[in-house]
């Protein structure tokens, strides 16, 4: 709390300008009118205030707007945003995408902070859903944003927004998140032709069920190994050797290098060795010829 002291003669600020950098904390408190500061917030970011000086300016705005800042002030906070707490931000009502962009610009290159997370949460809740423009903006600043959301939060993403998602935005998503996103992507891209569809859907395939993988295997898609390794194990296991061969095309040779890793390892254990031998890759570990294959999935589920 800054002590209340009278402003020295001739030091009363007529406008927000660079002369204020020479003011001590108590002089800023005494000589800068909060209403003047609010109307000239756009000038603050051009002035090299220290964090301590920014604390004083924030204190003045807090006194002027105890219920939360208006959007006209929020849009021009600049580096002052770095001094806001999540509690401050929860009082705001940010509706303009331009305001969101301005504040994310200040945080460009920073790790996702509690302040930014709160700002985004307030903005998205205010909009009711994660629309395409918002998602475009957020993933441009934070490529990992989508994967930071819970499956429940992702369920509010409309399929139309999926067009804004880039492959790198899904890099850190786990299977539970892809389970939610995949059906939306399938819906969003449903009117595209085969090869174009595969290019778009590829990043989301970690959420694809077996039947969709079987369908893709009939379309000469030549899935790369990196994509195959991200598929759900339970979706890969029922695929036949012939289906995997068609799905991977020329990339099928890569299975040998991945034979000890999931899902390839588990898939090999489910295939007849005779069938694996037809690939000519030397894959070992399949079911020997003459053995009876029982489906234990029901038994596993019960135990």
């Amino acid at each position: 709390e800054v002590e209340k002291t009278a402003c020295p003669s001739g030091k009363k600020a007529r406008e927000i300008d660079e002369s204020l950098i020479f003011y001590k904390k108590w002089e800023l408190e005494a000589c800068v009118d909060a209403a003047l500061l609010a109307t000239q917030m756009d000038r603050v970011n051009a002035i090299p205030f220290t964090y301590e000086q920014l604390d004083v300016l924030k204190h003045k705005l807090d006194e002027l707007y105890p219920q939360g800042y208006p959007e006209s002030v929020i849009q021009h906070l600049g580096y002052l945003f770095l001094k806001m707490s999540p509690e401050d931000i929860r009082k705001w009502n940010v509706t303009s995408l331009e305001t969101l962009k301005a504040l994310l610009e200040v945080n460009k290159g920073h790790e996702m902070s509690p302040q930014v997370a709160t700002l985004i949460d307030r903005f998205v809740k205010g909009r009711g859903q994660l629309d395409k423009d918002t998602l475009d903006t957020l993933t441009a600043f934070y490529p990992g944003y989508l994967c930071s959301l819970s499956p429940e939060e992702l369920s509010s993403v409309p399929p139309s927004s999926i067009w804004a998602v880039r492959p790198q935005d899904l890099d850190t998503c786990d299977p539970r998140q892809l389970d939610v996103l995949y059906p939306k992507a399938r819906l969003a891209f449903q009117n595209m032709n085969g090869s174009e569809y595969f290019v778009k859907i590829q990043s989301f395939l970690g959420g694809a069920p077996t039947e969709d993988l079987k369908a893709l295997s009939q379309q000469n898609v030549s899935m790369d190994l990196a994509t195959f390794m991200k598929l759900r194990t339970d979706a890969v296991l029922p695929l036949t050797v012939a289906e995997v061969q068609k799905l991977l095309g020329p990339h099928v040779e890569g299975l040998k290098a991945e034979e000890r890793h999931r899902p390839v390892r588990d898939w090999i254990l489910r295939q007849r060795q005779d069938d694996l031998d037809t690939l000519g890759l030397g894959l070992q570990g399949g079911i020997p010829n003459g053995y009876l294959v029982l489906d234990l999935s029901m038994q596993e589920a019960l135990s």
Partner: antibody, heavy 117, light 107 residues
């Protein structure tokens, strides 16, 4: 008076890890943002990370992103830098500095990190 | 990233000389500029912030000026303890960046 003392430097092999510490005294540590800056032999100064007073706001330059982690313990008046996957180009004197926003007003004496096989 | 270019890279001068060092930013940084002095084996020491604000305890022979992209550090009358490397640094945008220094040597 304000004092910043770095420690933890030394010789490490490429791919190795090191943890630097910076002990602060003479000011209210929990009120201040803190930064790490480094200077490779005969090279320019490079600011590469900072952390806010509460620890909630963090920045990494691209040169260290994903490899270095900045943290602080306000109860111990200490700033830390965990450095993983070290490379030869990380060889430098590492300084911690008090960050006041428009400049760095106090610096430590530095600690030398040498990455070599 | 904003590039900071200092010139000259080194200057030879005598005690009592007036020395001027310039720093140019690759884009407008308003007055978000600081100057530091570094002596061999020592940490940099802040001289000037906000382009022209002299840090407490720094002799008045040091002065800074400029705004936008062009900045100047002036030592009005060089003293023996002033022989060192001088760096400029911008704080207008992240990442903060430094100039590569100007070495002030004895003539």
């Amino acid at each position: 008076q304000v004092q910043l003392v770095e420690s933890g430097g030394g010789l490490v092999k490429p791919g190795g890890s090191l943890r630097l510490s910076c002990a602060a005294s003479g000011f209210t540590f929990s009120d201040h943002y803190m930064s790490w800056i480094r200077q490779a032999p005969g090279k320019c100064l490079e600011w590469f990370s900072y952390i806010s007073s509460s620890g909630g706001i963090i920045y990494y330059a691209d040169s260290v992103k994903g490899r270095f982690t900045i943290s602080r313990d306000n109860a111990k008046n200490s700033l830390y830098l965990q450095m993983n996957s070290l490379r030869a180009e990380d060889t430098a004197v590492y300084y911690c500095a008090r960050d006041v926003g428009s400049h760095f007003d106090y610096w430590g004496q530095g600690t030398l990190v040498t990455v070599s096989s | 990233d904003i590039q900071m270019t200092q010139s000259p890279s080194s200057v030879s001068a005598s005690v009592g000389d007036r020395v001027t060092i310039t720093c140019r930013a690759s884009q407008d940084i308003s007055r978000w500029l600081a100057w530091y002095q570094q002596k061999p084996g020592k940490a940099p020491k802040l001289l000037i912030s906000a382009a022209s604000r002299l840090q407490s305890g720094v002799p008045s022979r040091f002065s800074g000026s400029g705004s936008g992209t062009d900045f100047t550090l002036t030592i009005s009358s060089l003293q023996p303890e002033d022989f060192a490397i001088y760096y400029c640094q911008q704080a207008k945008s992240f990442p903060r960046t430094f100039g590569c220094g100007t070495k002030v040597e004895i003539k």
